[in-house]
């Protein structure tokens, strides 16, 4: 069973001093943040017993394995059901505490009732404050039964539940008709899944015979020991004030476990600590009684004295629960109550015994759960004891259960049962997860779900290049940390597998499924150099660069050009996807902007060093386009252009530029400057006769503006071939500007 205890402090004079503490003795309990241990949960369960809302309760975590609930402001806050949940995975367990108001109309004679399947359970509610009205019994909040108030027997209302079955388990309450639910008597009924003394899926297995009020768990056959007792069969008493499966916990405060209710995993339920009894666990046991709720009687023989915490304390020469066994009778010594081995191991088990006459090797035997008897292979004889050593054959899962060491001499016999847990080494159910990769390293999360048993003591990561026959490389890592595999080959697939181990010999599990993880490309190392750039318009920039010459193939897939506009805080990235490219045209830039420019080589997703940056100032955008451009042929070699000035000019025009192109021609267009910006017409001369031309123009202030509409016009026929177009603005002749 899970080592989980819910303690309720029942000093009820002041509700603000009331607290509930949940303590886990499980390894790794309550850490929550790691994959191996979910957190302890402690809460009030309002599903069945609903009480008026109050201020929220305060939850405090004390270390990794303890959580405390405080903040109760009034007695009604305490009434109801509280639960603590702890343990991991299939071992996750809920422990329940039911609190009754000491001032209720009806009080339970006994809160927790643990019964076997098929038994008759009797719940008894004692009248504390009488009302002459019906008593209503509920089960898990729903109506269950009614009793007339005359049906009380000796001031008690009884609910008989014959032939109970596990579904009958739950919270029962007895309430006077139309009384507050806070005045109810609340009970907890736990119905074991088997008849008395049996456990297992078909209830075919025999319980170990739990002592001192321990209860046999119907699923695993283990004894759930009362607080203050330990051992496979609860045969051993803890020191006063101690509890937990290994007596490892200590009751808080100077008065030890007085005033505390202990709740343990089902099917135990709740009781006072060892040595205490009463509804508030504040009364010491009467003489001759001991244990949880003082339910046990000492009946000591041969001069033994009764200790209310541990039972009979025997005088020299005697032992046994009632001091009924003489020390002449052989006795098994210091046998561990529980041993743990890994599957398929061949452990050695020691069993020591003393007595008069002295036990010898052949007088000690070991019996497995299936009845097989093992004889010891060797014995170590010391003055006060004989220790027999048994070599156990390869363990299988069926070997889990209660083993027995038995000693027999002419003086009598003794036996000691102990629990052997055969654990299955953990096997990962999933492959490890890749977190990040670089060219020569992989960062891997080894935490995966697994079959078999924990706790996980070590995690081994095995890896080698894919399709390789070379030996696996292995790295041992902390279970809760990510692993970096280093010194790998770039752009290489690696097969990676996890192997988990649990404590003990043979605890290494099989390797988990492989996964393929691929390292990144090698980083490009060459640094480009910006050779030059020139502005091809207010929003266009041509950039050229070079790379240093190095032997061997170029490591790179292309180039990344970056333009940083510091004024606006914007970056423009341009991808050039050929590693052979050494020039690029950047368009759509913002006119009049100061850019910082650099270029980097890239390979896969990795960037090489950036070139030293260059600073580029684009000219501001020019004026709007001239309006109403019109062309008119004057002769076989002259065409007159007329236009209107652009509207909304940002400043004075410095010149106009006319573009002349033969319609349908393949050659480059000619640009002709009109340097007298006040003019609105010009004559283009030197044209070919009977030829169709296309014209458009734009203005310039600091930069060139937008093009006007394109117009077409043909020169007149029968002229001679001209040398080429020239322009005349009114009477002035201007040279050709290409």
């Amino acid at each position: 069973a899970v080592d989980l205890t819910l303690l309720a402090n029942l000093r009820l004079t002041d509700p603000q001093r009331f607290f509930l503490t949940c303590v886990s003795g499980e390894a790794g309990a309550g850490r929550g943040s790691d994959a191996w241990g979910p957190p302890l949960l402690l809460e009030k369960d309002d599903r069945i017993v609903r009480t008026p809302p109050g201020p929220p309760l305060r939850l405090a975590r004390n270390g990794s394995h303890q959580v405390t609930l405080r903040g109760f402001s009034k007695p009604s806050d305490l009434v109801g059901v509280f639960s603590c949940v702890g343990g991991a995975g299939a071992r996750r367990t809920r422990v329940i505490y039911v609190h009754n108001s000491p001032g209720a109309h009806l009080l339970p004679d006994k809160v927790t009732h643990t019964v076997n399947k098929g038994d008759t359970a009797v719940l008894s509610a004692r009248v504390h404050k009488e009302k002459q009205t019906d008593v209503i019994w509920k089960s898990n909040g729903s109506y269950f039964y009614t009793l007339d108030w005359h049906e009380a027997q000796d001031g008690r209302f009884l609910l008989q539940l014959p032939n109970v079955q596990p579904p009958s388990s739950g919270i029962y309450s007895a309430t006077y008709l139309e009384a507050s639910p806070l005045g109810s008597a609340f009970f907890r009924l736990i119905v074991r899944g088997c008849g008395a003394g049996r456990w297992g899926p078909g209830c075919t297995k025999e319980c170990p015979g739990c002592l001192h009020g321990g209860v046999c768990h119907d699923h695993d056959g283990e004894c759930v020991c009362p607080p203050g007792f330990t051992g496979t069969r609860c045969e051993q008493a803890c020191r006063e004030g101690r509890f937990g499966q290994s007596c490892q916990e200590q009751c808080p405060g100077i008065s030890g476990c007085r005033g505390l209710t202990f709740c343990l995993p089902d099917p135990y339920g709740c009781s006072c600590g060892s040595g205490w009894r009463g509804s508030q666990c504040q009364e010491a046991c009467a003489p001759g009684h001991f244990g949880a709720d003082c339910r046990l009687q000492c009946q000591c023989q041969n001069g033994g004295t009764c200790d209310r915490f541990s039972g009979c304390v025997c005088p020299s020469g005697w032992h046994g629960v009632h001091c009924e066994k003489s020390d002449r009778i052989p006795q098994i010594l210091n046998m561990a109550s529980e041993l743990e081995f890994n599957l398929e191991t061949m452990p050695r088990i020691n069993c020591a015994a003393a007595g008069n006459p002295f036990p010898v090797r052949g007088s000690i035997e070991l019996r497995k759960p299936d009845g097989t008897v093992l004889l010891s292979t060797k014995a170590i004889v010391e003055p006060e004891k004989t220790t027999a050593e048994f070599e156990v054959p390869r363990l299988v899962l069926a070997d889990s259960g209660f083993w027995e060491c038995r000693v027999s001499t002419s003086g009598g016999q003794d036996s000691r049962r102990f629990k052997v847990n055969v654990k299955v080494p953990p096997v990962p159910l999933a492959a490890p997860r890749l977190l990040t990769k670089q060219s020569r390293q992989l960062v891997v999360s080894p935490l995966v779900s697994f079959s078999g048993d924990g706790p996980i003591s070590t995690v081994r990561l095995h890896y080698r290049p894919q399709d390789s026959t070379m030996d696996w490389s292995t790295i041992v890592v902390d279970p809760s940390e990510n692993v970096t595999l280093m010194n790998l080959r770039p752009k290489t697939g690696y097969s990676v597998r996890v192997q988990l181990s649990r404590p003990g010999e043979g605890g290494e599990g099989a390797w988990g499924p492989p996964t393929l993880m691929t390292t990144d490309c090698p980083e490009p190392l060459l640094q480009p150099w910006l050779e030059g750039w020139h502005v091809e318009g207010t929003d266009r920039l041509r950039v050229s660069w070079s790379l240093p010459l190095v032997p061997g193939p170029l490591v790179g897939d292309g180039f990344l050009l970056r333009l940083w506009d510091g004024t606006r805080g914007q970056e423009r990235r341009e991808n050039v996807s050929s590693p052979q490219a050494r020039t690029a045209l950047l368009t759509g830039l913002t006119p009049g902007t100061h850019y910082q420019l650099d270029v980097q080589l890239y390979h896969c997703t990795l960037l090489g060093p950036a070139s030293p940056p260059a600073h580029v100032l684009l000219p501001p955008s020019g004026p709007p386009a001239p309006r109403h451009l019109h062309a008119q042929a004057l002769s076989d070699s002259e065409i007159q252009l007329t236009w209107k000035h652009p509207e909304a000019l940002p400043g004075p025009i410095s010149k106009y530029v006319v573009e002349v192109q033969v319609a349908g021609g393949a050659g480059d267009p000619l640009w002709i400057d009109v340097d007298r910006p006040e003019e609105t017409s010009t004559i283009i001369r030197g044209l070919n006769a009977s030829t169709r031309y296309l014209f458009r123009m734009r203005a310039s202030i600091q930069g060139l503006g937008d093009w006007s509409n394109t117009v077409e016009e043909s020169t007149l026929g029968n002229g001679l071939q001209a040398e080429g177009p020239v322009q005349e603005s009114r009477a002035a002749e201007e040279g050709l500007d290409q």
């Epitope: 209503i136 269950f144 009614t146 009793l147 049906e151 139309e178 009384a179 109810s184």
Partner: antibody
């Protein structure tokens, strides 16, 4: 599905006897307190008798005390009302009804009623 | 034994709010249930514990209980609401019924 089915009603002369039955199904009959409630023609509802789940405790309205006996057979899931010394004023539709207690409450209410059986006392 | 008093009849137009009162000595200290009985049918619980509705009962039906009066309220009354309505309380596990109110939807 919870069902209550009354039977045994009919015409009877004053001073005569009649035994009503109520067959219950669809619930754990032995856990519930059961009632007989009657309704005279054109009148309101009147409580007649109640019996506790164990059958050990029974109560009656003053108007029927000493003449009517309520009983139950938990093994047969049946409620009975033995009516003796019948009078004209006992003429009514007789309903058997179950009470329950809701979640979060300690108060009864009638959650299921039978369809009723008519008892006519006349000469 | 306690007595619960109801008006014999109440008439409302469709869509109006109907309020049926049930009075009795210190009624607010007890839980009241209300039952609807349509002509020729068995009673059906419409409210218990003063104001709680069983499943299937429309939200138009609500209740309150304080002082000496418990009230059943039907808002937006419909023709299907035409029936006799009985209040009921408990006197030491003995059921006490009101005389009933016939609700007529005009």
């Amino acid at each position: 599905e919870v069902q209550l089915l009354e039977s045994g009603g009919g015409l009877v002369q004053p001073g005569g006897s009649l035994r009503l039955s109520c067959a219950a199904s669809g619930f754990t009959f032995s856990s519930y307190m059961m009632f007989w409630v009657r309704q005279a023609p054109g009148k309101g509802l009147e409580w007649v008798s109640r019996i506790y789940p164990s059958g050990g405790w029974t109560y009656y309205a003053d108007s029927v005390k000493g003449r009517f006996t309520i009983s139950r057979d938990n093994s047969k899931n049946t409620l009975y009302l033995q009516m003796n010394s019948l009078r004209a004023e006992d003429t009514a539709v007789y309903y058997c009804a179950r009470v329950t207690v809701p979640l979060d409450s300690g108060s009864y209410y009638f959650d299921y009623w039978g369809q009723g059986t008519l008892v006519t006392v006349s000469s | 034994q306690s007595v619960l008093t109801q008006p014999p009849s109440l008439s409302v137009s469709p869509g109006q709010t109907a309020r049926i009162a049930c009075s009795g000595d210190n009624l607010g200290s007890r839980y009241i249930s209300w039952y609807q009985q349509k002509s020729g049918q068995s009673p059906v619980v419409v409210l218990y514990q003063d104001y709680r509705r069983p499943s299937g009962i429309p939200e138009r039906i609500s209740g309150s209980n304080s002082g000496n009066t418990a009230t059943l309220t039907i808002s937006g009354t419909q023709a299907v609401d035409e029936a006799d309505y009985y209040c009921q309380a408990w006197d030491r596990s003995t059921a006490v019924f009101g005389g009933g109110t016939r609700l007529t939807v005009l």
